[in-house]
């Protein structure tokens, strides 16, 4: 593994990013700061490319499938929460084939700076930006009611993920500005349909007083769908991510529908996960068990075909489901939970000034913001034997109560040499039926000076397509010294959050 | 409270260029939008444009695209309106408001008289 | 651009009256979008009505507001010496946000 050019790799990292925008499931697109590292390895005919690329969140929804750059900014003023990013990415590419990008997997840390940046030296917080975004859902609710009284063709739509939260207190009022994906649930699906998505921002505001957040003075919503059977692949891999998923046996173009507009409304655009209080579940039960009762549950998993098994699944909660290797000294490939939580109960701060919201929380309890070298974490296992599952055609979202037994897809493909996944206490290994790739992991608002903890560098094997050896595995461990003409410059628009990054990696 | 002060009257000169400042107290400036608005006796009130001083980000109406430049110093709390090219279609009074995220403009600057003559 | 015409321009109304001005869209504007503002000579325009009917602290009870899609009215319901003021009417549904032209109000 050499290191390279920053800026001679800029297209591959634009390509990478705009790859794992498509592969994610919810959230809002990445938009591209800076390559902060890259080197790369030729093995045989494919550049192997390791890549480490500083982000900041858009205001538009990975639902859109836009390409990162292609995000306007909304013609609306909402508050807009500023969050940043870093991922670290392996992606390879065929000589033969130069248009032939592919992400192999990539783990993403993001945290909130916005209330870093504020300068509240003289001044009362006004605005805050709340982590724990599932609170809100009876606001959300409330506003797709009030949508689908205007629009008969949201009728059977559902509130899927809560995903930001903002308030504003002003001398007239306060607004709750709440975002959030929704999902078609028709009555009728024999046979069934690819679900369609779509995305809401609501704007609800109170009189200064006012308790009761059920009866906001005022409400505006606008929705806009995106209807995956005119879509690249929202239900999975886009091209070159891997064999693409298919509804029926059809793979799916990429445009979608114009924006959903009440008659009147404003062209309003626009800025977290949901998590529990109290232990999480066992791991069979984790997907159906969070968030208020069906049909309010998770959002789904992404529906699959059996072929496409050994590439991604996406997880619920923006850090997505990995699977875990048996052996303890070496329990997990990318160590992170689904459910952002605390297992050991530390809260990531003891106190965050101007939130007064539980946090996206941290799954060994300790705070983010000391450096682990090599991005590693300081527990050598997970505490909890947290499984991907892989439903068989079909996810469990806010349209479906949950088979009392999954079908696991994949029949037929073994386990990974020494692979087996954990079921949790008591329940013994059952073979291994999908790996899951790629993580995005949300951590607690990062206060001033302090630094973006990098992500986890530990991906595991993966053979190369195409490649003589298959199960000999072809990519290096992920470097960890500073390529010499990285990192590139930051791209113009955001200047101040280049201090939230680290500027070189542990030695 | 809330308040945000604007430069003194400008006297300018056609084809000069000038740069009129507002300092915003008593809240988070970085957060919100900094509106301009521009007053011309018999004119009404025009939006020129806008700026969120924690990010840079700008939109200006397209009438004032190149007549107006927006910048905004987060260290001193202060927004700037730079207009150049001057011509006597340029005096005017202009307004610094803070947007308030309810869809109006809730604080107001006191105005910058801005005449432009040979 | 949403243009939006005010009327009269100009008007005057002996104390104790009625007084209603009018405020037309040139495309249609949501009433959370339509706002007022009160401007007395040498001062800053002051937000006096929002989304369409609600009276921004501090302004009397005698004002009100009303309208929806491109027709909006301010209605004050007994004019008094210090409603003296130009009105001006606000759309921020879509930009470039616009302004009326102004009613002027004066004391006949």
């Known amino acids: 593994v050499s290191p390279t050019d920053c800026s001679a790799v800029e297209p591959e990292a634009e390509k990478a990013l705009d790859l794992i925008n498509k592969r994610r499931r919810d959230g809002y697109l990445f938009q591209l700061l800076r390559i902060a590292d890259a080197h790369l390895d030729r093995v045989e005919n494919t550049t192997v490319y390791y890549l480490v690329l500083d982000v900041q969140e858009s205001d538009c929804s990975v639902l859109s499938r836009k390409y990162w750059n292609d995000c306007e900014p909304p013609d609306s003023r909402r508050p807009s929460e500023i969050v940043i990013g870093q991922c670290k990415v392996i992606a390879t590419r065929h000589s033969h084939e130069s248009q032939d990008l592919r992400v192999i997997d990539f783990n993403c840390t993001t945290s909130s700076v916005s209330s870093a940046l504020a300068n509240t030296k003289d001044s009362p917080v006004l605005i805050d930006f709340f982590e724990d975004t599932e609170r809100y859902r009876k606001q959300a609710n409330k506003a797709l009611e009030k949508y689908k009284e205007e629009n008969d063709d949201f009728a059977s739509f559902r509130v899927d993920r809560i995903e930001r939260v903002a308030r504003v207190r002003g001398g007239e009022g306060t607004g709750y500005f709440v975002d959030f994906s929704v999902r078609n649930c028709p009555r009728h699906h024999f046979p069934r349909h690819p679900n369609v998505f779509g995305f809401c921002r609501a704007d609800l505001f109170y009189d200064v007083e006012a308790l009761d957040l059920e009866s906001p003075k005022n409400l505006v919503i606008n929705c806009e769908v995106f209807d995956p059977q005119e879509h690249e692949n929202i239900n999975g891999v886009p091209p070159h991510l891997g064999h693409p998923f298919h509804w029926g046996g059809h793979e799916r173009s990429s445009t979608t529908k114009p924006p959903f507009k009440p008659h009147g409304s404003r062209d309003h655009h626009h800025p977290h996960k949901p998590h529990e209080h109290g232990p999480p579940p066992p791991p069979d039960e984790r997907d159906h068990s969070h968030g208020p009762p069906l049909p309010q549950g998770p959002p789904p998993l992404l529906p699959m075909s059996c072929s496409s098994c050994q590439h991604a699944t996406f997880g619920t909660n923006g850090a997505q489901r990995h699977s875990h290797n048996n052996n303890s000294s070496d329990l997990h490939p990318h160590k992170h939970h689904s459910h952002e939580q605390h297992p050991h109960g530390h809260h990531p701060h003891a106190h965050h000034p101007h939130e007064h919201d539980t946090h996206r929380q941290h799954p060994h309890g300790h705070h983010p913001h000391g450096h682990h070298p090599h991005g590693h974490h300081p527990h050598g296992h997970h505490p909890h034997g947290h499984h991907p599952h892989c439903h068989d055609f079909q996810d469990y979202g806010p349209c479906d109560p949950p088979p009392h037994n999954q079908g696991h897809c994949c029949h037929g493909h073994g386990p990974p040499p020494g692979h087996l996944r954990r079921r949790g206490p008591g329940k013994g290994p059952r073979p291994f039926h999908c790996r899951q790739i790629g993580s995005v992991y949300r951590l607690p608002p990062l206060r001033k000076g302090e630094v973006l903890p990098l992500p986890e560098a530990n991906f595991p094997s993966f053979p190369l397509p195409h490649h003589k050896h298959p199960l000999k595995p072809d990519n290096q461990p992920f470097p960890q010294s500073v390529s010499e003409s990285c990192p590139g410059k930051f791209k113009s628009g955001f200047p101040q959050v280049s201090m939230f990054f680290t500027h070189t990696f542990p030695k | 409270q809330v308040q945000l002060q604007q430069s003194g009257a400008e006297l300018m000169k056609p084809g000069a260029s000038v740069k009129i400042s507002c300092k915003a107290t008593?809240?988070?400036?970085?957060?919100?939008?900094i509106e301009w608005v521009k007053q011309r006796p018999g004119h009404g009130l025009e939006w020129i444009g806008e700026?969120?001083?924690?990010?840079?980000?700008?939109n200006y109406n397209e009438k004032f695209k190149g007549k107006a430049t927006f910048t905004a110093d987060t260290s001193s709390n202060t927004a700037y309106m730079q207009l150049s090219s001057l011509t006597s279609e340029d005096s005017a009074v202009y307004y610094c408001?803070?947007?308030?995220?309810?869809?109006?403009?809730?604080?107001w600057g006191q105005g910058t008289t801005l005449t432009v003559s040979s | 651009d949403n243009v939006l015409t005010q009327s009269p321009a100009i008007m005057s109304a002996s104390l104790g009256e009625r007084v209603t001005m009018t405020c037309t869209a040139s495309?249609?504007?949501?009433?959370?979008?339509l706002h007022w503002y009160q401007q007395k000579p040498g001062s800053s325009p002051k937000l006096w009505i929002y989304?369409?009917?609600n009276l921004a602290s501090g302004v009397p009870a005698r004002f009100s507001g009303s309208g929806s899609g491109t027709s909006y009215s301010l209605t004050i319901s007994s004019m008094e010496a210090e409603d003296a003021a130009t009105y001006y009417c606000?759309?921020?549904?879509?930009?470039?946000?616009?302004f009326g032209g102004g009613t002027k109000l004066e004391i006949k």
């Open positions: 700026i969120l001083p924690g990010s840079g980000r700008t």
């Open positions: 495309s249609s504007v949501s009433s959370s979008y």
């Open positions: 606000h759309q921020y549904h879509r930009s470039p946000w616009t």
């Open positions: 008593g809240y988070t400036f970085s957060s919100y939008w």
């Open positions: 989304s369409t009917s």
């Open positions: 408001a803070r947007y308030s995220y309810f869809y109006y403009f809730d604080y």
